[in-house]
């Protein structure tokens, strides 16, 4: 019998300063190339070793961008939103939602990584 | 081994165009990002234009916005760079260079530093 898997999604402000090859991270998503079914957002792919998004810690690959220095991200273009980053200034304010996985296995179910018996 | 080999390259004067080619071989390039970099005399290298798989997307240093145009023919394995109206600043060692693209767009500009493999380079000279 499989577990259920749940998702808790929690949001979080996560401020960046620009470093000297930038913020550190790509993005797939946008209306015209949709990374999740049904859902246009913008996501983090990769964050790049040693850049401002890695070395801050907080943004994850995976995570969703809702808002760039206040500005919703729905309902844009991918390059629209590539460019809005680019064009973000040296401090950047993001809107992150975080989304991580929940295992919840059958009632008595031992995991594998359970040091228990 | 990835190996690049530009091609091209040569005297011309102002106002002339030149297109350079660089020939890939040792990897599947229509998976990678590829550039053009340039480096003049005295000079530190600097980006040109990038060619990224992934979304099809071009950029070009402002220098060379509307004059440059980077294209790539992933049936040869081969990028090119179109160059119009040639100045003497553009005189410079060019390079073209190549990382294996990732999923989804670098929100930075290009930056040499991402670029794993490098051509040993066709002089331009503009006079």
């Known amino acids: 019998m499989n577990g259920r898997v749940d998702y808790l999604v929690t949001e979080e402000e996560i401020n960046l300063t620009r470093g000297p090859s930038g913020l550190g991270f790509n993005i797939v998503g946008g209306t015209d190339q949709q990374y999740v079914s049904n859902d246009s957002g913008i996501y983090v792919s990769r964050i790049k070793e040693n850049g401002a998004a890695a070395l801050d810690g907080r943004l994850q690959e995976g995570d969703k961008i809702l808002s760039v220095n206040g500005q919703d991200l729905k309902n844009l273009l991918h390059q629209d939103a590539v460019d809005l980053f680019r064009n973000a200034g040296y401090a950047v304010s993001l809107r992150v939602q975080h989304r991580l996985q929940v295992q919840n296995g059958p009632i008595g179910h031992r995991g594998e990584g359970d040091p228990s018996g | 081994e990835v190996q690049l080999v530009e091609s091209g390259g040569g005297l011309v004067q102002a106002g002339a165009s030149l297109r350079l080619s660089c020939a890939a071989s040792?990897?599947?390039?229509?998976?990678?990002?590829m550039a053009w970099f340039r480096q003049a005399p005295g000079k530190e290298r600097e980006f040109v234009a990038e060619d990224s798989w992934s979304n099809h997307r071009v950029w070009y240093s402002d220098s060379v916005k509307g004059r440059f145009t980077i294209s790539r023919d992933n049936a040869k394995n081969t990028v090119y760079l179109q160059m119009n109206n040639l100045k003497p600043e553009d005189t410079a060692v060019y390079y073209c260079a190549t990382y294996r693209d990732y999923s989804g767009s670098t929100v930075d500009p290009p930056n040499q530093s991402e670029y794993d493999y490098w051509g040993q380079g066709t002089q331009v000279t503009v006079s």
């Open positions: 040792g990897g599947t390039f229509s998976s990678y990002a």
